[in-house]
């Protein structure tokens, strides 16, 4: 049990005991969510005491403060996910229509995702927020009509399901167009029929 | 309680530059960010920028980027900014604004305004 | 740029009477809006964030809406102290506030 001797800088516990050089012992090291009130000497381990409301340390430490909290930055395009405690600082991910553009360990800016032209759509991301958009062109039987970061492509109308023929086939930018059984085409769509 | 202290007004001459502070007291500046809002006379609101007070990063607007350097002071829970190159369209009042961790996207604290007058 | 523009920008209304006023954002904001209250001379007040909860101690008769581009502040009856100019603002992407609403008593 700490605080004990090493010759060798070593201690037993790494994640949780620190060597101190200056006695040249073990000690423990302060539990997330607290720091360092009074340092280990040869006869007394480690005080401790709980972070003060808005900060926090997230992990095993012998620090004589605690980090400050701080908020996710608008401005950078972030929100928070998760509040700051005293074990864990504030969580925070990208706006959504945003992807991270900068990471510095964690995102530190995001920026607007771009848009996806008419006739794409974006490629689905194994996580949201991750990188701009891929637009990939929409597969076969299906269209997209807009500019959009976010619009998906939708399968063209069956006009039989609706009880109507196709007056015109569907595009990767348009609908299937469709019309009454009964109404006429207009002159240009009728071709001449050859017996 | 948050509270933000600037001064009522700075008189300053064309061509030269004024400092403008704003004193938080109640709240930790190293938690937040500071933010600048002008207002020309009869007109609205329009955002400035903010700063960082524990690494002095700053983001402003294009418009002044060159025009206003803000500045934070940790041990005195100070923010500061400062417009150079004074021109009669600087006129307006300047408040300050901190976004907290429980108003991290809103302004729910103001400064009361410093009154920026530029005069020969 | 993302742009918000208020509408009305003058309205006079009387004691008692439901007032809406409407702020639109040029793109899709995903209600990401707050309103401000600023009477003359002193500084804008929080009145509801994130576009629709209340800020502490503000009356309940201020209640807001909205999604997408289109948001709206209504204050359900009227007040003599209501008299002041309202902005909206954006703070996705970036903050931007509206032109403001200057709302008078008839």
């Known amino acids: 049990v700490p605080p004990y001797g090493s010759e060798n800088q070593t201690c037993r516990d790494q994640e949780k005991e620190y060597y101190e050089p200056r006695h040249r012992i073990c000690c423990s090291r302060c539990p997330p969510g607290t720091y360092v009130s009074a340092k280990c000497s040869r006869s007394r381990d480690t005080v401790c005491a709980t972070c003060a409301e808005n900060s926090y340390n997230e992990h095993w430490n012998y620090l004589t403060i605690c980090q400050l909290c701080r908020p996710c930055d608008p401005v950078m395009g972030l929100e928070e996910i998760a509040p700051c405690t005293s074990k864990r600082k504030t969580q925070c991910r990208c706006q959504p229509g945003m992807f991270c553009a900068a990471w510095a360990l964690e995102c530190t800016h995001c920026e607007l995702l771009s848009d996806c032209p008419p006739g794409t759509e974006a490629e689905l991301k194994d996580e949201v927020g991750k990188g701009n958009n891929h637009c990939v062109p929409c597969k076969a039987g299906h269209f997209q009509n807009t500019s959009s970061p976010s619009a998906r492509c939708q399968p063209h109308t069956r006009c039989e399901d609706q009880g109507l023929v196709e007056a015109a086939p569907g595009t990767a930018q348009s609908d299937t167009t469709c019309r009454n059984p009964s109404e006429s085409l207009p002159p240009e769509m009728s071709g001449t029929m050859l017996m | 309680e948050v509270q933000l202290q600037q001064y009522g007004a700075e008189l300053g001459k064309p061509g030269t530059s004024v400092k403008l502070s704003c004193k938080v007291s109640g709240y930790n500046i190293g938690n937040t960010y500071i933010h600048w809002v002008i207002q020309r006379p009869g007109k609205g609101l329009e955002w400035i920028g903010r700063?960082?007070?524990?690494?002095?990063?700053?983001i402003s607007t294009e418009k002044f980027k060159n025009k206003a350097t803000l500045t934070a002071d940790l041990s005195s829970n100070t923010a500061y900014m400062q417009l150079s190159q004074l021109k009669s369209d600087d006129t307006a009042i300047y408040f300050c604004?901190?976004?907290?961790?429980?108003?991290?996207?809103?302004?729910?604290?103001w400064g009361q305004g410093t009154l920026v007058t530029v005069s020969s | 740029d993302i742009q918000m523009t208020q509408s009305p920008s003058q309205l006079s209304a009387s004691v008692g009477d439901r007032v809406t006023l409407s702020c639109k954002a040029s793109q899709n904001i995903y209600k990401y809006l707050n309103w401000y209250q600023q009477k003359l001379g002193e500084a804008p007040r929080l009145l509801i964030y994130?576009?629709?909860i209340l800020q502490t101690g503000i009356p309940s008769r201020f209640s807001g809406s909205g999604s997408g581009t289109d948001y709206t502040l209504t204050i359900s009856s009227l007040q003599p102290e209501d008299a002041a100019t309202y902005f909206c603002?954006?703070?996705?992407?970036?903050?931007?506030f509206g032109s403001g609403t200057k709302l008078e008593m008839k």
């Open positions: 994130s576009t629709n």
């Open positions: 603002q954006k703070y996705y992407s970036g903050f931007t």
């Open positions: 700063i960082d007070p524990t690494n002095g990063n700053t």
């Open positions: 604004a901190p976004t907290t961790l429980t108003t991290p996207d809103s302004f729910a604290y």
